[in-house]
């Protein structure tokens, strides 16, 4: 939606720095937007020699870079922090790195968890 009415979305939530930033560590985040504003889900992570370190996941404010993306795909070649965003409930559960310059596609599957809703 995001055209004429407020949008509500649900995203997977995670914050590695949750204690300092006074948030929950993980769960589900219900995002409630302003009128005519889109909301997205996002994921950010680091890749240290093939080891994935999740940094943050959650709701992302209206951003044209995220429009009409059904899947969370990071396209930067080799950043310090990988980032992807998408539209659709829980679309940030799985996230992928597919560099624009070509190279192997790497998809990250989340471990099974019992998520709690953040309010």
């Amino acid at each position: 939606s995001g055209r004429g009415e407020a949008e509500t979305r649900e995203c997977i939530y995670y914050n590695a720095n949750w204690e300092l930033e006074r948030t929950n560590q993980s769960g589900l985040e219900r995002c409630e937007g302003e009128q005519d504003k889109r909301l997205h889900c996002y994921a950010s992570w680091r890749n240290s020699s093939g080891t994935i370190e999740l940094v943050k996941k959650g709701c992302w404010l209206d951003d044209f870079n995220c429009y009409d993306r059904q899947e969370c795909v990071a396209t930067e070649e080799n950043p310090q922090v990988y980032f992807c965003c998408c539209e659709g409930n829980f679309c940030n559960e799985r996230f992928t790195h597919l560099p624009e310059a070509g190279g192997p596609e790497v998809t990250y599957e989340p471990p099974p968890t019992a998520p709690t809703l953040l309010t």
Partner: antibody, heavy 120, light 107 residues
């Protein structure tokens, strides 16, 4: 419309404390965090910390730890920033700023600022 | 703490000029970057968030770009009301930090 209105200018002596208020209106008070930023005369912006109005939890920059206390009153949609053991270097304009709970957390609405002068 | 370095610290320009301000983070912050405009005696005003998203009500002559450590604010055609100081700010990691500011002055 969305507004943050801060209390008036203060003049304090070194060693004293100051308490600045920031009254929010035009939005759901508990749906946004409130951050505090200060600016010394002719200088840049310095982040001090924030309060989560819904639960009252706080996080402060290490520089201000032990000297700053941020509180809120949900019945009046007001947040407060108290700075103790004032010194001349604390002379600055203090701003409150509303921040979305959602990433990437921009400071989208600011108060008009409160000038605090510390002088003997 | 993440250091934010802005350049130049000041720039002289004329109405109609294209002005570019850069901001560099000491470590990767992905797209957790905002730009603010501040005029003398006034509170800062949000221009850009998420490195490139224009805040509602901000003229389209302002644009932001970049990701990771290097970011740019561009004013495509400077207007009289754009003479001000501009700050970048990261919200990726606490403590949040600001750049030192860039003053855009009349040539």
């Amino acid at each position: 419309q969305v507004q943050l209105v801060q209390s008036g200018a203060e003049v304090k002596k070194p060693g004293a404390s100051v308490k600045v208020s920031c009254k929010a209106s035009g939005y759901t008070f508990t749906s946004y965090r409130m951050h505090w930023v200060r600016q010394a005369p002719g200088q840049g912006l310095e982040w001090m910390g924030f309060i989560v109005p819904s639960g009252g939890s706080t996080s402060y920059a290490q520089k201000f730890q032990g000297r700053v206390t941020m509180t809120r009153d949900t019945s009046t949609s007001t947040v407060y920033m108290e700075l103790s053991s004032l010194r001349s270097e604390d002379t600055a304009v203090y701003y409150c700023a509303r921040v979305s709970m959602y990433a990437p957390e921009p400071m989208d609405v600011w108060g008009q600022g409160t000038t605090v002068t510390v002088s003997s | 703490d993440i250091q934010m370095t802005q350049s130049p610290s000041s720039v002289s320009a004329s109405v109609g000029d294209r002005v570019t301000i850069t901001c560099r983070a000491s470590q990767g912050i992905s797209r957790w970057l905002a730009w603010y405009q501040q005029k003398p005696g006034k509170a800062p005003k949000l221009l850009i968030y998420a490195a490139s998203s224009l805040q509602s009500g901000v003229p389209s002559r302002f644009s932001g770009s970049g990701s990771g450590t290097d970011f740019t604010l561009t004013i495509s055609s400077l207007q009289p009301e754009d003479f001000a100081t501009y700050y970048c700010q990261q919200a990726f990691s606490h403590p949040w930090t600001f750049g030192g500011g860039t003053k855009v002055e009349i040539k």
